[in-house]
């Protein structure tokens, strides 16, 4: 299985050159490890470690998306591995740059069909039940380099090959250049700028900034839809209250989203979902009565 | 050593709903995708569907959309299929499988099998 | 949906002789990364079935190398040499290129 792989890899995990990036500077703390008689240090982080068995749950995930999707097995899931790696193991966590996910990216190129892309903000499980029954439209995690990282955390060390599953940096408490962060940044950069047709994006109408220009949505994802490409974006606003019927595409932070990528000369357009149970429902059985109305 | 340990045979009566499990053990449950298959009496294999452990996520035949339900229990390395309105013809011998991987790459081929389970729609 | 379409035998199959089983895929099962997406299992009675051959031509773990499978994009042939009591069963071709996974309706083999 993938642990015996891995087993017989560790050794491997010193072999290929690895360029560093600057000696340490940040707000991290720093605390001994190792039991040589000479103490050696391990950079101590506000976020929490990598997760456990990170390198066997990105192998097993790659595995399992190139098994169900076809078209990918093309992919090397040992390649696409130690490109990963290779993207942040001995290199100072704080100091990650896009340049070093590109062999990744490289590895992971997908192109989503045209009218076919689904951004979301603040709503990922909403986001991804829908193109779970929708199953022509795509999230970033229905991608295989999203779907690799999706809900993982990981980190190295300066001049060390080893993962750190101790702590990672926190974005906001010690850097936003971490490997997590560059990570999504990457990837989400990469999947706007790719689209085409007509994009949608779900948001979430329960929150104080339906539209948040902090989001990765509202910093990487709307810069980076191409205009020659991209003839209409479409927010789809999803309700929290059963009896919610304002209509919260007159929101302010919907309107600034508007002039934002009315901007870029994309088109906008904004549904309100009122019942998000029902607009499921409806997905998975458009032909119900009950769907005939609006939700 | 991989097991499926599938659940014993099953009596339903039409329009009802039964669900079978299929018990993993000897390698990580999250780490595969599941498939299920259909083998009528005397009959040949006939693949339902997938489901990803680790996400719930699930891909179906065409014809078994409407008549499977594909779930995992993670704490129990449990897959399920439930099937719904039961009528004769979903009288079968229903198996997990999984497949082997070869040098981190999925083989194609379902490797591991359950002992089925047999589903008959009696009135 | 790829369509497995499997001959029959000239049954019974003396002990000891070579079978050869044929399998027709609708289209070609070779994938762009040069990997035949072609099966074969033997369900012997009573039993679940068994990988004998993935990628067309590679040995399951544990398989006797009586067993051999061979082939083009859309014609296979898997060769038992040496038929023994033990590989009484229905054999199945199963195409894994694209989903669904289809099956063949299975050739059964009985031994003289």
């Known amino acids: 299985g993938l642990n015996d792989i891995f087993e017989a890899q560790k050794i491997e995990w010193h072999e290929g050159s690895h360029h560093h990036h600057h000696h340490h500077h940040g707000s991290g703390s720093l605390v001994p490890r190792g039991s040589g008689s000479l103490p050696r240090w391990r950079q101590q982080w506000s976020g929490s470690g990598t997760t456990s068995r990170f390198p066997e749950t990105v192998l097993a995930r790659c595995v399992k998306y190139t098994e169900v999707h076809p078209e990918m097995r093309h992919v090397d899931c040992q390649s696409v591995w130690d490109a990963f790696k290779g993207a942040f193991i001995s290199k100072y966590p704080c100091n990650i740059t896009e340049e070093d996910y590109q062999p990744l990216v490289k590895l992971g190129t997908q192109t989503v069909p045209c009218n076919k892309t689904l951004l979301w903000s603040r709503i990922k499980d909403l986001a991804h039940q829908f193109t779970q029954v929708q199953r022509d439209m795509f999230t970033l995690e229905d991608m295989l380099l999203g779907y690799l990282a999706d809900d993982l955390t990981w980190c190295g060390e300066f001049n060390t090959f080893e993962i750190n599953y101790q702590s990672c940096p926190d974005w906001r408490k010690d850097c936003s250049n971490n490997p997590v962060s560059v990570f999504w940044k990457t990837v989400s950069r990469r999947f706007a700028e790719t689209a085409c047709g007509v994009v949608h994006v779900m948001l979430n109408g329960s929150r104080s900034k339906i539209f948040d220009k902090n989001s990765t949505f509202g910093s990487v994802e709307v810069h980076n839809l191409q205009p020659e490409k991209v003839q209409a974006l479409e927010a789809w606003v999803i309700h929290g209250g059963r009896e919610d019927s304002r209509d919260l595409c007159q929101d302010p932070t919907i309107k600034e989203l508007e002039s934002i990528i009315s901007k870029r000369n994309i088109r906008f357009f904004c549904k309100n979902i009122y019942r998000p149970d029902k607009f499921l429902q409806c997905v998975k059985n458009p032909e119900d009565s009950s769907c005939l109305s609006g939700i | 050593e991989v097991q499926l340990q599938q659940s014993g045979p099953e009596v339903g009566r039409p329009g009802s709903s039964v669900k079978i499990s299929c018990k993993a053990s000897g390698y990580i449950f999250t780490d595969y995708i599941m498939h299920w298959v259909k083998q009528s009496p005397g009959q040949g294999l006939e693949w339902i569907g997938w489901?990803?452990?680790?996400?719930?996520?699930?891909d179906y035949a065409e014809k078994f959309k409407k008549k499977a339900t594909l779930t995992a229990d993670t704490s129990s390395s449990t897959a399920y299929i439930q099937l719904s309105s039961l009528t004769s013809e979903d009288t079968a011998t229903y198996f997990c499988a999984r497949v082997a991987i070869i040098t981190t790459v999925a083989s194609g081929g379902f490797a591991y099998w359950g002992q089925g389970t047999l589903v008959t729609v009696s009135s | 949906d790829i369509v497995m379409t499997q001959g029959a035998l000239p049954n019974p199959v003396p002990s000891g002789e070579s079978a050869s089983i044929t399998c027709q895929s609708s289209e070609s099962l070779l994938h762009s990364n040069g990997k035949t997406y072609l099966n074969w299992y033997l369900q012997r009675p009573g039993q679940s079935p068994q990988l004998l051959i993935y990628w067309m031509s590679t040995r399951a773990a544990g398989v006797s190398d009586r067993f051999s499978g061979s082939g083009s994009g859309t014609d296979f042939t898997l060769t038992i040499s040496g038929v023994e009591a033990e590989d009484v069963g229905v054999y199945y071709c199963q195409q894994f290129l694209e989903y669904p996974p289809t099956f063949g309706s299975g050739t059964k083999l009985e031994i003289k």
């Open positions: 489901i990803d452990p680790e996400y719930g996520s699930t």
